[in-house]
């Protein structure tokens, strides 16, 4: 067991020319944090995959307000050292991601906002108990430097932070078979401890906690011998004697995932499946706790009140991910109401209404017709986030204020004069059409295309259209 | 934990005033909008007013429009309600609720306990 | 305004019973549409946003279903602790508004 250590020394443009902008300005003031994501080996693994070793958020720096015309400098960095334990041994080898996050502490609609600013990635060898390594890394026009280490924790000594000491228990010398623990010469290497139960006889370890069976022997503990009755379970190498297959030990038996992590077999050995919240080989390893807000925009930490303990985040609406790290596309959840646009600045959300609606998303209808009088005994009609009024006869306009010109539509056909009544129009219809519109021929032999016309009324003469 | 207590309410006579107070914690009260919802004895819920984490956006029901104001002190973590000309059917269990994350959806996802206003002669 | 209408008014149903509840919009809310639990004396819970989304720390026996102007609020197997009145609220325009209620009670 151990932790692996991370100083941030700086984080601010790199040389060259294209400097960045600052990220912080007077309208958004914002503040920086870190992540360091730990995996084993010299993995190319996506950033989005599990850290297997470990991850650790620090703390959020200093509020930081970009000078106007000043160049960005390198910028105020959280205090204190990033640690993440694991309780495995030291790989040697190991990929590690870094992210620089900014926190915009700006009053903007929907509050501060979380956006990352940089992430840089490598692969480095090192050994536990080693001095600081230093390293400079640039993510685009971005310049971090850091150092980092990895100690073990006692009584863990060694590269691998697997050798056990113990103090003496003489003064003069370690027991049959031990060597004295360098560089602590006052203590002796320790035997390894095997997991508790493990048969002395039939059982052994090369890491602290587990227990290997030696062969004829399984269990979690070894103390079972293998069946030859039985050939149900085709795994082990032949049996001369039976003549079929005896099963040796499985690598998930007794499952070695902790902390409820599933196992599933490999063709070289096992592959723990992890609950949210462990790492490690074994699940072993919880490096992150509520204590280190590993909830990212505004989502809420519950349990995981020690590193033993699994953390869970409640992510707000619009996030998603084990951490809230991931901004759902909102724009795919039409937050804007009543056909608006929607526009996804990062930053923030906003909408484009339609002609009609107002408010952050659309969400306020300004036509409709509350409160809203049609005059001259016109009605209101409402629908789709428009208001219209439907007039009586003689008014028009939106809000049937205007007198209507009823010949302005100019109804009369066939040259037939309009004139304005005070109920309507009048047709006055030129020689040989009749109709209160002017729309009937008249014929020559007197007859119309229609009965003839009311008594009293010749064709030609006008007529009221009501 | 997030918790909103409400404060102020009280017997007042038709036509006269009083102020509802809100108070937030466990959650940062400047990234999210506030509504007052209330209830009268017996009866479903109504909204009554809103406003968004800034301040800049408020709306209120018809039914309280140009007598309720609503406010906010982001620096005082306090939500308030100025309600005038206070009439018998304003008579009702006042809560305070707080508003989704950016207002996406509109939704009262934490609610106070209510303070009780009786408008009664 | 937008008029929600919630029915049944009231259900008697018995534990372990699956429970629908409906709630019908005047007009087309989307996706616009939360569920709320109250009980006496208390003070309203959100249950479900956006139609069908569980709200942190809301068991998974609460469902929710629909879009457009009809949606459901499903129980799969009712515990003594989900005898309450349920009211569904329209986030799509405002003013919001809200059902009239649904008060479930024990058989």
């Known amino acids: 067991a151990g932790v692996f250590e991370l100083q941030i020394h700086s984080f601010g443009p790199g040389p060259g020319p294209g400097a960045p902008r600052s990220p912080c300005s007077a309208r958004l003031p914002c503040r920086l944090f870190f992540r360091v994501c730990l995996k084993p080996g010299l993995s190319e693994e996506a950033a989005e995959s599990p850290c297997a070793l470990g991850a650790a958020l620090s703390a959020r720096g200093p509020v930081y307000t970009e000078q106007p015309g000043a160049p960005a400098p390198d910028l105020p960095l959280p205090d204190g050292l990033l640690q993440v334990p694991f309780r495995d041994a030291w790989p040697g080898t190991f990929s590690f991601i870094i992210e620089t996050w900014r926190e915009e502490l700006g009053d903007q609609i929907g509050g501060p906002a979380w956006s990352l600013l940089a992430r840089v990635a490598g692969r480095r060898r090192l050994a536990a108990g080693g001095p600081w390594a230093r390293d400079i890394q640039r993510a685009g026009a971005w310049e971090l430097r850091f150092s980092y280490r990895a100690r073990c924790e006692p009584p863990a000594v060694g590269t691998a932070c697997t050798r056990l000491c113990r103090p003496r228990s003489a003064p003069s010398r370690c027991g049959p078979g031990l060597r004295p623990c360098a560089p602590l010469e006052d203590e002796c290497e320790a035997p390894l401890v095997c997991r508790a139960g493990c048969s002395p006889e039939h059982g052994f370890c090369e890491q602290p906690g587990e227990c290997r069976c030696l062969e004829g022997w399984t269990g979690p503990l070894c103390t079972v011998p293998v069946s030859t009755s039985s050939c149900l379970s085709p795994r082990g190498p032949s049996s001369a004697t039976t003549g079929c297959l005896v099963p040796g030990p499985g690598p998930c038996d007794g499952n070695p995932c902790a902390n409820g992590g599933s196992c599933s077999e490999t063709p070289r050995s096992f592959e723990c499946t992890c609950p949210r919240g462990f790492y490690g080989l074994r699940c072993e390893v919880s490096g992150v706790t509520c204590a280190d807000g590993p909830c990212f925009n505004g989502g809420l930490c519950v349990g995981g009140a020690d590193p033993d303990s699994a953390y869970i985040c409640h992510c707000p609406p619009g996030f998603q991910g084990s951490n809230c790290e991931k901004r759902v596309d909102r724009c795919s959840l039409q937050p804007c109401r009543n056909g608006g646009l929607c526009l996804d600045l990062g930053h923030a959300l906003r909408c484009r209404c339609r002609a009609g609606f107002a408010g952050p998303r659309c969400e306020h209808d300004l036509d409709d017709c509350a409160g809203r009088a049609c005059a001259n005994g016109g009605t209101c009609v409402e629908g789709g986030g428009a208001h219209r009024c439907s007039c009586a006869l003689g008014f028009g306009g939106r809000d049937c204020r205007e007198r209507a010109d009823p010949c302005a539509a100019r109804p009369c056909a066939h040259g037939g004069r309009c004139y304005a009544h005070f109920s309507g129009l009048v047709c006055a219809c030129a020689p040989g059409y009749m109709g209160a519109r002017c729309e009937f021929p008249v014929h020559p032999d007197g007859a119309s295309a229609l009965p003839a016309a009311p008594p009293g009324l010749r064709p030609g003469d006008p007529q009221r259209y009501l | 934990e997030v918790q909103l207590v409400e404060s102020g309410g009280g017997l007042v006579q038709p036509g006269g005033s009083l102020r509802l107070s809100c108070a937030a914690s466990?959650?940062?009260?400047?990234?999210?909008?506030i509504h007052w919802v209330r209830q009268a004895p017996g009866k479903g819920l109504e909204w009554v007013a809103y406003?968004?984490?800034?301040?800049?956006?408020?709306y209120y029901a018809d039914t309280v429009k140009g007598r309720f104001t609503i406010s906010r002190d982001n620096a005082k973590n306090s939500l308030y309600l100025q309600m005038n000309s206070l009439r018998a059917e304003d008579t009702a269990v006042y809560y305070c609720?707080?508003?989704?994350?950016?207002?996406?959806?509109?939704?009262?996802?934490?609610w106070g306990q209510g303070t009780t206003v009786t408008v009664s002669s | 305004d937008i008029q929600m209408t919630q029915s049944p008014s009231s259900l008697s149903a018995s534990v372990g019973d699956r429970v629908t509840i409906t709630c019908r919009a005047s007009?087309?809310?989307?996706?616009?549409l939360n569920w709320y639990q109250q009980k006496p004396g208390k003070a309203p819970k959100l249950l479900i946003y956006?139609?069908?989304r569980l709200h942190s720390g809301v068991p998974s026996r609460f469902s929710g279903s629909g879009s457009g102007t009809d949606f459901t609020l499903t129980i799969s197997s009712l515990q003594p602790e989900d005898f309450a009145t349920y009211y569904c609220?329209?986030?799509?325009?405002?003013?919001?508004?809200f059902g009239g209620g649904t008060k479930v009670e024990i058989k």
């Open positions: 007009r087309d809310i989307t996706k616009f």
């Open positions: 609720a707080r508003g989704d994350y950016e207002d996406i959806f509109y939704t009262m996802d934490y």
């Open positions: 466990g959650f940062t009260f400047s990234d999210y909008g």
């Open positions: 956006y139609t069908s």
């Open positions: 406003i968004s984490s800034g301040g800049y956006t408020i």
């Open positions: 609220q329209q986030g799509n325009t405002l003013p919001w508004t």
